[in-house]
C-alpha cells in the first residue's frame, strides 16, 4: 500500500476581490486516520483557515461532503475575498495522536492572489 500523499494541483489562483476562491486538495489514501487542516503560510506563525475536526469558520465551505466515509477531496471555498487574504495556502494531513494529532503530510501549497476591484 502506497503512503498517503496530499495533492494541491494548483500552484496559484487569482481571484477578484469580493469573489469566492476555490483551493483544491485531495489525498491519495484514507489511511492513516486523522483530520485535514488548511493553513495560510508556513512555520510556527501560520494561520489556521479550516479544521475538519472542530471550530467555526464562517467564510469557509468544503467542496465535497466530508461526512462521506470514502471522501478524499478536501478542497475548500473561501468567500468574500479581500486583498488581506493573499498568501500561500497549505492543505495538511494529520495522523491521530495522543494527546495531540501529529502533522503527517502537507501539500505543496497554492498561492492566492487577489485582484483589486476596479474603481
Amino acid at each position: 500500500e502506497e503512503e498517503l500523499q496530499v495533492i494541491q494541483p494548483d500552484k496559484s489562483v487569482l481571484v477578484a476581490a469580493g469573489e469566492t476562491a476555490t483551493l483544491r486538495c485531495t489525498a491519495t489514501s484514507l489511511i492513516p486516520v486523522g483530520p485535514i487542516q488548511w493553513f495560510r503560510g508556513a512555520g510556527p506563525g501560520r494561520e489556521l483557515i479550516y479544521n475538519q475536526k472542530e471550530g467555526h469558520f464562517p467564510r469557509v465551505t468544503t467542496v465535497s461532503d466530508l461526512t462521506k466515509r470514502n471522501n478524499m477531496d478536501f478542497s475548500i471555498r473561501i468567500g468574500n475575498i479581500t486583498p488581506a487574504d493573499a498568501g500561500t495556502y497549505y492543505c495538511v494531513k494529520f495522523r491521530k495522536g495522543s494527546p495531540d494529532d501529529v502533522e503527517f503530510k502537507s501539500g505543496a501549497g497554492t498561492e492566492l492572489s487577489v485582484r483589486a476591484k476596479p474603481s
Epitope: 489511511i31 486516520v33 483530520p35 475538519q52 461526512t67 462521506k68 466515509r69 470514502n70
Partner: antibody, heavy 118, light 109 residues
C-alpha cells in the same frame, strides 16, 4: 440541547417490514452523518447502518445488507430505517445516533423496541 | 462475535481505579470511543477519538491508547459508575463501526 427521538417500533411477524423514524433537534441535522445501532435483549451493541450528511452515501454491515435501508429527509430533520425480511434475530432496541467528524457516536436517542415474533 | 475484545467483567472497590481495555483494531485505520450504559437506559458517550472527553462527562473518566489497545480509566470509582461499558470503533478500512462485547463494572461493597 441535542435531542434524538425514535419511533415506529412494534411487533412484526418474521418476513415482515417496519420503518423506524428518528426526529432530530438542537443541532444542524443536515451537517451531521447519522447511524442506527441496535441492542438485542441482554446482548451488546451492534451498528446496523450509517448515512452521510447529504444522504447520498449509505453503509451497512453484512448482517443487514440488502434487507435494511437507511435514509434521511434533511428538510424534516428526520432519519429513517426501513427494515424488510425481518427475522427473529432482528429483535432489539434500535437507537439512532449522531456521528462525530470521524464517525464515532456522540449523542444517542432513547431507543425504540422492535420485536419479530409469530 | 465481536470484532473488538474487552473483558466481560471488572470489579473494583469504591474510591479505587478501574481500568477496562479494548483491542482488535489497527492503529492506523481505527478511532475508538467508550460508551456507558446503565440498565434500561440508552448509551452515553464517555470518550471519543481514543482519548477525548465530552464537556459533560466527569474528569474521573479518561481514555488512553497504546498501539492497538485503548484503555478506559475510571479514577475514584463511585457506586453510580456501576454499569456496562462498551468499546466502539470506526474502521476506516471497511467503513464500519465495530463494538466490543461490553464490560460489566461492579462496584464492591
Amino acid at each position: 440541547e441535542v435531542q434524538l427521538v425514535e419511533s415506529g417500533g412494534g411487533v412484526v411477524q418474521p418476513g415482515g417490514s417496519l420503518r423506524l423514524s428518528c426526529a432530530a433537534s438542537g443541532f444542524t441535522f443536515s451537517s451531521n452523518a447519522m447511524s442506527w445501532v441496535r441492542q438485542a435483549p441482554g446482548k451488546g451493541l451492534e451498528w446496523v447502518a450509517g448515512i452521510s450528511a447529504g444522504g447520498s452515501d449509505t453503509y451497512y454491515p453484512a448482517s443487514v445488507k440488502g434487507r435494511f435501508t437507511i435514509s434521511r429527509d434533511n428538510s424534516k430533520n428526520t432519519l429513517y430505517l426501513q427494515m424488510n425480511s425481518l427475522r427473529a434475530e432482528d429483535t432489539a432496541v434500535y437507537y439512532c445516533a449522531r456521528e462525530t467528524w470521524n464517525h464515532l457516536f456522540d449523542y444517542w436517542g432513547q431507543g425504540t423496541l422492535v420485536t419479530v415474533s409469530s | 462475535s465481536y470484532e473488538l475484545t474487552q473483558p466481560p467483567s471488572v470489579s473494583v472497590s469504591p474510591g479505587q481505579t478501574a481500568r477496562i481495555t479494548c483491542s482488535g483494531g489497527s492503529y492506523s485505520s481505527y478511532y475508538y470511543a467508550w460508551y456507558q450504559q446503565k440498565p434500561g437506559q440508552a448509551p452515553v458517550t464517555l470518550i471519543y477519538s481514543d482519548d477525548k472527553r465530552p464537556s459533560n462527562i466527569p474528569e474521573r473518566f479518561s481514555g488512553s491508547s497504546s498501539g492497538t489497545t485503548v484503555t478506559l480509566t475510571i479514577s475514584g470509582v463511585q457506586a453510580e459508575d456501576e454499569a456496562d461499558y462498551y468499546c466502539g470503533g470506526y474502521d476506516q478500512s471497511s467503513y464500519t463501526n465495530p463494538f466490543g462485547g461490553g464490560t460489566q463494572l461492579t462496584v464492591l461493597g
